[in-house]
Amino acid sequence: QPDAVNAPLTCCYSFTSKMIPMSRLESYKRITSSRCPKEAVVFVTKLKREVCADPKKEWVQTYIKNLDRNQMRSEPTTLFKTASALRSSAPLNVKLTRKSEANASTTFSTTTSSTSVGVTSVTVN
C-alpha cells in the first residue's frame, strides 16, 4: 500500500525575490513532486507563514543547511508531514496549490513544538 495517499501537495509557482532574515525562520519543506511546476524550498516562519524560495540560490542552500544543523540540536527531533488542514492565511509571496499526493513534501523543524499550522507532527524514529 502506498503511504499517506491522501496527504496534500504544496506547489510553488514563483519564488521570493527577497532574502528572508534567518532569525525569522522555523523550518522548511523540500518540494520535489513532478506534479509541481518546479522543485522548491518552502520556508516556514516563526509566525507560521510560508514563503517559496529558489533552491538554487546560495542563500537558500545556506539557510537550509543551517536549519538542518539546528534540527539536530533540538530535542525531541520532530519531522512534520503536510496534513489535510489548510492554513487560513495566504503564503507571503505566491499561490500555493494543495493537491492530494503521498509524501509530496517534508518539513524540517528547528523547534520542539509538536504542532504547526497546516501540518501534523510525526516523531522521527
Epitope: 538554487k56 538542518d68 539536530m72 524540517f108
Partner: antibody, heavy 117, light 107 residues
Framework: QVQLVQSGAEVKKPGSSVKVSCKAS????????MHWVRQAPGQGLEWMGR????????KFDPKFQGRVTITADTSTSTAYMELSSLRSEDTAVYYC??????????WGQGTTVTVSS | DIQMTQSPSSLSASVGDRVTITCKAT??????LAWYQQKPGKAPKLLIS???SLETGVPSRFSGSGSGKDYTLTISSLQPEDFATYYC?????????FGGGTKVEIK
Amino acid sequence: QVQLVQSGAEVKKPGSSVKVSCKASGLTISDTYMHWVRQAPGQGLEWMGRIDPANGNTKFDPKFQGRVTITADTSTSTAYMELSSLRSEDTAVYYCARGVFGFFDYWGQGTTVTVSS
Amino acid sequence: DIQMTQSPSSLSASVGDRVTITCKATEDIYNRLAWYQQKPGKAPKLLISGATSLETGVPSRFSGSGSGKDYTLTISSLQPEDFATYYCQQFWSAPYTFGGGTKVEIK
C-alpha cells in the same frame, strides 16, 4: 510525466572520448540540476558531477575533474556528458538524473559505454 | 569526501521477513540521506529522502530512520518484488557519495 531519455550504447577505443545525451520531457531543465552517475559492471553507483542548465555552472567529483565535461541545451531540454581519455575502467552504464537537492528522483534508462581495444 | 559504509553487502531472506540495512557516514550528514532500490538492468529508484521521508507510491513497508552518522532502511515484511540491491546516498555535501550496496536475495 517526467521522462529522461538517453542516447544509445557506445563502444569506444582507449584514449578516445564519448558523449552521452539525456533528453528531458515533462520538466523544464533550467529549473533543476542535471546529474550524471555511473555504474561499472557488478559495481556500485558513482556520482560524477552535475550542471545547472540555467547558467551552465558545473560541479564535479574531483576524481573526474578535467576529464569530464557536462553541458546542457535548454532549447532542446537536453543534457550532455562527455568523458575523454577513455580507459577500460570507464566501461560502465552512465545515467543522467535530476535533482536540485542532491538526491535523484528521476533517472534516465542508462547508456552502456564499453571501452575496448 | 564523505564515505558511506553500507552493511551487510548481501543478505538472504524469505518473503514476510523483516529486513534491516544500515548505512554509516564518516561524518554527520544531518539526515540528508537517500535510499534507492535497483533491479538488474534497470535504473535506481528513489525510495526515501531526508532519511525518513517515503517517496510517492513507495509501499509503507519501507521505512527509514537514523540521525547523525548512522541510518537504517527497514522493510517490515519482505515481498517478492523487494528482492533487489539497495543503496544509500548522502546529499549533505558534494561530491555526493553512495554506499556499496546491499543485495537482498531469496533464501
